[in-house]
């Protein structure tokens, strides 16, 4: 209810606009399976309105419910490739805080070479989103091959 | 009813409520890769408001940051048809005006018969989304398998 | 400026922010390919608020424009347990009542051990959403690998 | 701005090895990636080798175990050494670096007996 009466003085910012759309700047070193994104209208048709990038990854900024999408490509890829080198499998999850660590979404290429999802899921302010590719593989940087991108849906 | 009160202060356009879902209509000629969209209440469950069709094409009314979506089904196809076939590519982009033409999100079929993706883009008016399926294949006209849309997200 | 200063006369629930993310719950017995769904926060990072559960199948409260979305993993999958199975298909339509009854989406595994989509579609007041499973292969319960929603876009 | 030059390619027999140099005008440590492609005439430009700036690689299934590639980040060079050349490997060579460049001229590599 409090919402409801508060909601009446609210000007566009607060309707929590907040949304993302990234594209991917490297990979980390062997050892780490995080890929590193960067956003901003000098990089093309990536933004940032809202959330933040710390270190290469998306940090949220608003309570509320989010939709969150990726689509991911390998570079150098074929289909015997995919299943040469399986399994390499993204996964979407809170990295931090550690309290609230959790895998949100995951699949696998098996004889793919991109993998594309979305869903619906909560996330708090001070939320860190990490996208961790594991296996050999290396993602392509093309701008319409490999993006990660959240909408703010509601409190 | 309160829905309909309240909206009364605030005419619905101009939350740019501009959505859109198209169905397939027909693919071009021979040296033609562009697919050709319909829509409206007539044809089933696709609609267009806000979004125009241009000679099957789809053209944006109102600026702002849209979630594009889109899946294509091929229609005769198993993963050997798919691979041998291959490459077969979907690409979404701009077409038109030819200062803003770029691509906006691009998959291949591999060994699988279903392409389905979407993501978060800026959009102005007037610009005129191009899907394009490069290969010998044709996609199904079935229109659970076969559905391209977008949606206005923020100014 | 118009958008901020009407925005003071719209409360938050007639804006119909119904929305809804599932986790898989079982499947129907032999003869039955429908999924059963759960949600709600005791369970993890599902919900429902507005759209409700029958029978863990997802009932639509609101009338309007929804964003349909899924993803669905096989338990036990390699590309070769999803060829030799083949077809694994999975639908989403509108299964009661019988008058509106449609398939809205319609994915086939071929290859691959992960489907996902999502598509904009009018639904009603009432309308029930089935998501049939058809074949012998088991959805993963892991609600990062198979889960479903719904978002209300626009009136 | 980044120019890239290509050199080391030949006429090699069926089984005989080439290794390609392409130097860079600018820091390797620069770009994601630094790959080696190949163009048979009619046909797409291949992608078959990359080097991320951190050292990780990847091949296309037609040349693994074959061609090899690395860097001299002294000398802002990067290699590819092929060996076990078929007649398939036939095509022109460029190195290009992701985000892209300029094409090069290339490095024609021919296997034939």
């Known amino acids: 209810q409090r919402f409801a009466q508060a909601q009446q003085q609210l000007p566009l910012e607060s309707l929590g606009w907040d949304v993302a759309e990234l594209q991917l700047n490297h990979t980390g070193p062997q050892q780490d399976p995080r890929l590193y994104w960067q956003g901003g209208p000098a990089l093309g048709r990536s933004f940032l309105h809202g959330p933040e990038l710390d270190k290469g990854q998306l940090r949220i900024h608003r309570d509320g419910i989010y939709m969150v999408h990726i689509q991911v490509t390998l570079a150098i890829c074929s289909s015997t490739t995919a299943s040469r080198h399986h399994p390499t499998t993204l996964a979407v999850g809170i990295c931090s805080p550690a309290s609230r660590s959790i895998s949100l979404l995951r699949l696998s290429f098996h004889q793919g070479c991109t993998i594309a999802s979305q869903r619906l899921t909560p996330l708090a302010r001070g939320d860190t989103l990490c996208t961790n590719l594991t296996g050999t593989l290396l993602p392509s940087r093309n701008t319409d091959e490999t993006f990660f991108g959240v909408q703010w849906v509601r409190p | 009813q309160r829905f309909a009160q309240a909206q009364q202060q605030l005419p619905l356009e101009s939350l740019g409520w501009d959505v859109a879902e198209l169905q397939l209509n027909h693919t071009g000629p021979q040296q033609d890769p562009r697919l050709y969209w319909q829509g409206g209440p007539a044809l089933g469950r696709s609609f267009l408001h806000g979004p125009e069709l241009d000679k099957g094409q789809l053209r944006i009314h109102r600026d702002g940051i849209y979630m594009v979506h889109i899946q294509v089904t091929l229609a005769i196809c198993s993963s050997t048809t798919a691979s041998r076939h291959h490459p077969t590519t979907l690409a979404v982009g701009i077409c038109s005006p030819a200062s803003r033409s770029i691509s906006l999100l691009r998959l291949s079929f591999h060994q699988g018969c279903t392409i389905a993706s979407q993501r978060l883009t800026p959009l102005a008016r007037g610009d005129t989304l191009c899907t394009n399926l490069t290969g010998t294949l044709l996609p199904s006209r079935n229109t659970d398998e076969t559905f391209f849309g977008v949606q206005w997200v923020r100014p | 400026q118009r958008f901020a200063q009407a925005q003071q006369q719209l409360p938050l629930e007639s804006l119909g922010w119904d929305v809804a993310e599932l986790q898989l719950n079982h499947t129907g017995p032999q003869q039955d390919p429908r999924l059963y769904w759960q949600g709600g926060p005791a369970l993890g990072r599902s919900f429902l608020h507005g759209p409700e559960l029958d029978k863990g199948q997802l009932r639509i409260h609101r009338d309007g424009i929804y964003m349909v979305h899924i993803q669905v993993t096989l338990a036990i999958c390699s590309s070769t347990t999803a060829s030799r199975h083949h077809p694994t298909t999975l639908a989403v339509g509108i299964c009661s009542p019988a008058s509106r009854s449609i398939s809205l989406l319609r994915l086939s595994f071929h290859q691959g051990c992960t489907i996902a989509s999502q598509r904009l579609t009018p639904l009603a007041r009432g309308d029930t959403l089935c998501t049939n499973l058809t074949g012998t292969l088991l959805p993963s319960r892991n609600t990062d690998e198979t889960f479903f929603g719904v978002q209300w876009v626009r009136p | 701005q980044l120019q890239l030059v290509e050199s080391g390619g030949g006429l090699v027999q069926p089984g005989g090895s080439l290794r390609l140099s392409c130097a860079a005008s600018?820091?390797?440590?620069?770009?994601?990636?630094i790959g080696w492609y190949r163009q048979v005439p009619g046909k797409q430009r291949e992608l078959v080798a990359l080097i991320t700036s951190n050292g990780r690689t990847n091949y296309a299934d037609s040349v693994e175990g074959r061609f090899t590639i690395s860097t001299d980040t002294a000398r802002n060079t990067v290699f590819l050494e092929m060996k076990s050349l078929k007649p398939e490997d036939t095509a022109v060579y460029y190195c290009?670096?992701?985000?892209?460049?300029?094409w090069g001229q290339g490095a024609q590599v021919t296997v034939s007996s």
């Open positions: 600018v820091s390797i440590f620069t770009f994601y990636f």
């Open positions: 290009n670096a992701d985000p892209s460049t300029d």
